[in-house]
């Protein structure tokens, strides 16, 4: 679609005459017919295919055309056409004498043609007028003309519609082939695709808008590179959505079990070795001088009661030393100067010779202990609770108050949870300080495994074109990560089929 | 070929919530060259353009309706949703979904068989 | 907002030309589709962008778009052309539909 501008600038007939050489009268009132068509190499009367037009009086004899454009629209002269513009064309323009006001072709008497000119050729689409001159025996005729496209209409012949737009079916102009220019930010055939932050991942990100960059299920961070662990993982990481691998000292499905409790809590203190032992669970080497579960009491040298036979310790700067009673003496008295004679064995004790009567060893009675049998029995002092259990001496006897998650006389046991097979279905049961916790087989969850769940949501494999599946174990469903060329909510159509239409 | 099935209730009280979901068959909801819009026709009346969503979730709506209406697009089911919120009798009508084409500049080329909803106490 | 006016109704003989008009504020500018629709049914897509067919449409069916009016072309026309025509255009990012023309074939 475009139009034939016709521009009109100067007739020239002196002497006012018609074709005929009979001179008008008074003078000859001068309009334009022009008649537009297909290209004859000779050309011809006949249908005007591609338009005519007529003009109204222009001018008296010799006149010049004044640009009339604004005032009307009557010069250029516009012969619209509404097809392909074939790049060739014949051109009629005839000059007509108006005796009236009637200027409809039945009306004139046929000897008022005053000139008569033909023209045919090339002529491309374009803004640049052609400026041509006619001239027969008695008038001259001087005038442009040019072919332009309509609006919205672009390329060599005026054939590719294009209408700038922006809104979400294109954002783009026209460039002067029709072709799309799209505005900053929007890519795609039509423009209509938003060109996304710069680095937002392609698979796992999208946009809206340009330079937005928003992540699909089960990844996230500002270029959707950063995969989201499963829901509830605290110690671990993932390397695709919906994981949770443990980091180094943790353990259990959400990484929240401590298997190095010595390295993240350090407690054993003054200086103790510290040894894991199972989860949440360790045990201290105290140095010498310190005692406690965590090595936390500093010891008294005197507190074991290495002196014997009743001799006093006393604590010095660099260990100690041992007072003896009459009768016995070394490091820690435990050399005796007495014999059974002396009476030596207390509180019921019975004395035993030995060595020919050079030396003594008491037997005590029960409740009894030390070389002379003169201390009463703390069963205590051996530390025989274990696992910080407290020691507490009860008479003759002695008990164990253990710590909680401990049972037994030594508090040597751990009590389990597990033992009444708490977890359903076959879930594994495993011990925690606070409780227990279950791990369910696939098909079951809840606390103890009692609720039954749909299965693995991906292992049916219901992801095409080599997508890769991710189970989104919170709501049991499946997300499909389409490669590039692909989409569908299992990657199963390819992008960008032809459209089909109904009829 | 490409189908589109509306279903939803066909009676709704005033003041209440209109709920309209649009299933595609034989096409992928996810393509980047369709946008899947509503219009509504009042019995007797013209059509009126509601409003499109892209597979992506960008929505666009008629500023007519925009403050009660929610288009939502499920790409796992090949659906989307239509809301419209504190409906009156005038929001009776024959509701259609259809596909607008990108290539088509927009012309819509495929149209659900359209549900009549009728508000009414 | 923007508006699409046509006219109510149109009348044609058999075998005769009808035109639609559609007529919008610089509706030049902007693509154009029409749709067609007998009683009961869905609406069809006759024309979109200006003047293009779908396949299916049938040649006497045709559009233009200039300055503020489309006009849709209905060439030879048949009883089966009975029914209502709506112009449709895009204002921004709303889909703007006419107020619809019932054509009757006498």
């Known amino acids: 679609s475009g139009v034939f501008q016709l521009q009109l600038q100067e007739f020239i007939n002196e002497r006012g005459v018609l074709a005929s050489g009979r001179p008008c009268e008074p003078g000859c009132r001068t309009f334009f017919r022009v008649c537009l068509k297909h290209f004859q190499a000779v050309v011809s009367p006949g249908p005007c295919t591609f338009g005519t037009v007529s003009t109204p009086v222009l001018g008296t004899n010799s006149f010049a055309v004044r640009d009339d454009s604004s005032g009307g629209g009557r010069n250029p002269l516009q012969l619209p056409f509404n097809f392909t513009w074939p790049g060739t064309f014949s051109l009629i323009i005839e000059a007509w004498h108006a005796p009236g006001d009637d200027l409809r072709p039945e009306a004139l008497p046929p000897d008022a043609l005053i000139s008569k000119i033909a023209i045919q050729g090339s002529l491309a689409v374009g803004q640049n007028w052609l400026l041509d001159e006619q001239t027969s025996t008695l008038t001259r005729l001087r005038y442009s003309y040019r072919v332009i496209c309509s609006d919205n209409y672009y390329g060599d012949n005026c054939s590719r519609l294009c209408k700038k737009r922006n809104d979400h079916f294109g954002h783009y102009v026209c460039q002067p082939d029709g072709n799309l220019s799209c505005l900053p930010g929007w890519t795609g055939e039509y423009c209509q695709q938003p060109i996304c932050l710069s680095g937002c991942h392609e698979q796992n990100g999208y946009c809206s808008k340009p330079a937005e960059c928003l992540c699909r299920p089960g990844w996230q961070g500002r270029l959707c590179n950063e995969c989201i662990p499963h829901n509830g993982c605290r110690h671990g990481t993932c390397s695709t959505p919906w994981q949770c691998t443990c980091d180094e000292g943790w353990g259990g499905l959400f990484c929240d079990q401590d298997l190095n409790y010595c390295t993240h809590h350090s407690p054993c203190k003054n200086g103790a070795t510290c040894s894991n032992s199972g989860q949440r669970s360790y045990t201290c080497t105290c140095r010498p001088g310190y005692t406690g579960v965590d090595c936390e009491l500093e010891l008294s040298e005197c507190d074991s009661n290495p002196c014997r036979n009743g001799g006093s310790c006393k604590d010095q700067e660099d260990g100690y030393h041992c007072l003896c009673p009459p009768g016995y003496y070394g490091l820690h008295c435990e050399h005796s100067t007495l014999s059974c004679a002396d009476s030596p064995c207390f509180n019921g004790g019975s004395c035993r010779e030995r060595n020919q009567g050079a030396n003594y060893a008491c037997e005590c009675p029960p409740n009894f202990t030390g070389s002379n049998c003169e201390k009463k029995v703390d069963r205590c002092t051996s530390n025989p609770c274990a696992n910080g259990g407290q020691c507490l001496n009860r008479g003759p006897s002695r008990m164990c108050r253990c710590r909680p998650g401990f049972t037994g006389t030594y508090c040597e046991l751990h009590v389990s949870d597990c033992a009444r097979n708490p977890c359903a279905h076959g879930g594994t049961c495993h011990d925690l300080e606070n409780g227990l916790m279950c791990t369910c087989p696939a098909g079951f969850s809840g606390r103890r495994c009692e609720v039954r769940t749909s299965i693995d949501a991906c292992a049916s494999s219901p992801c095409f074109n080599r997508a890769t599946c991710y189970t989104d174990l919170s709501t049991d469903t499946f997300v499909c990560n389409c490669p590039y060329g692909f989409v569908g909510s299992r990657c199963e159509f390819p992008v960008g089929l032809p459209p089909s239409f109904p009829w | 070929e490409v189908q589109l099935q509306e279903s939803g209730p066909g009676l709704v009280k005033p003041s209440e919530t209109l709920s309209l979901t649009c299933t595609v068959s034989g096409g992928s909801i996810s393509s980047s060259s369709y946008y899947w819009g509503w219009i509504r026709q009042p019995p007797g009346k013209g059509l009126e353009w509601i409003g499109d969503?892209?597979?992506?979730?960008?929505?666009y709506y008629n500023p007519s309706l925009k403050s009660r209406v929610t288009i939502s697009v499920d790409t796992s089911k090949n659906q989307f949703s239509l809301k419209l919120s504190s409906v009156t009798a005038a929001d009776t009508a024959v509701y259609y979904c259809?596909?607008?084409?990108?290539?088509?500049?927009?012309?819509?080329?495929?149209w659900g068989q359209g549900t009549l909803v009728t508000v009414s106490s | 907002s923007y508006e699409l006016t046509q006219p109510p109704s149109v009348s044609v003989s058999p075998g005769q030309t009808a035109s639609i008009t559609c007529s919008g504020q610089?509706?030049?500018?902007?693509?154009v589709s029409w749709y067609q629709q007998k009683p009961g049914q869905s609406p069809v897509l006759v024309i979109y962008e200006d003047s293009k067919r779908p396949s299916g449409i049938p040649e006497r069916f045709s559009g233009s778009n200039s300055g503020d009016t489309a006009t849709l072309t209905i060439s030879g026309t048949q009883p089966m052309d009975e029914a209502d025509y709506y112009c449709q255009a895009w204002d921004r990012d709303v889909g703007v539909f006419g107020s619809g023309t019932k054509v009757t074939v006498l």
């Open positions: 610089r509706l030049g500018d902007k693509y």
């Open positions: 259809a596909r607008e084409d990108v290539i088509l500049r927009g012309g819509s080329d495929y």
């Open positions: 969503i892209y597979y992506t979730g960008s929505t």
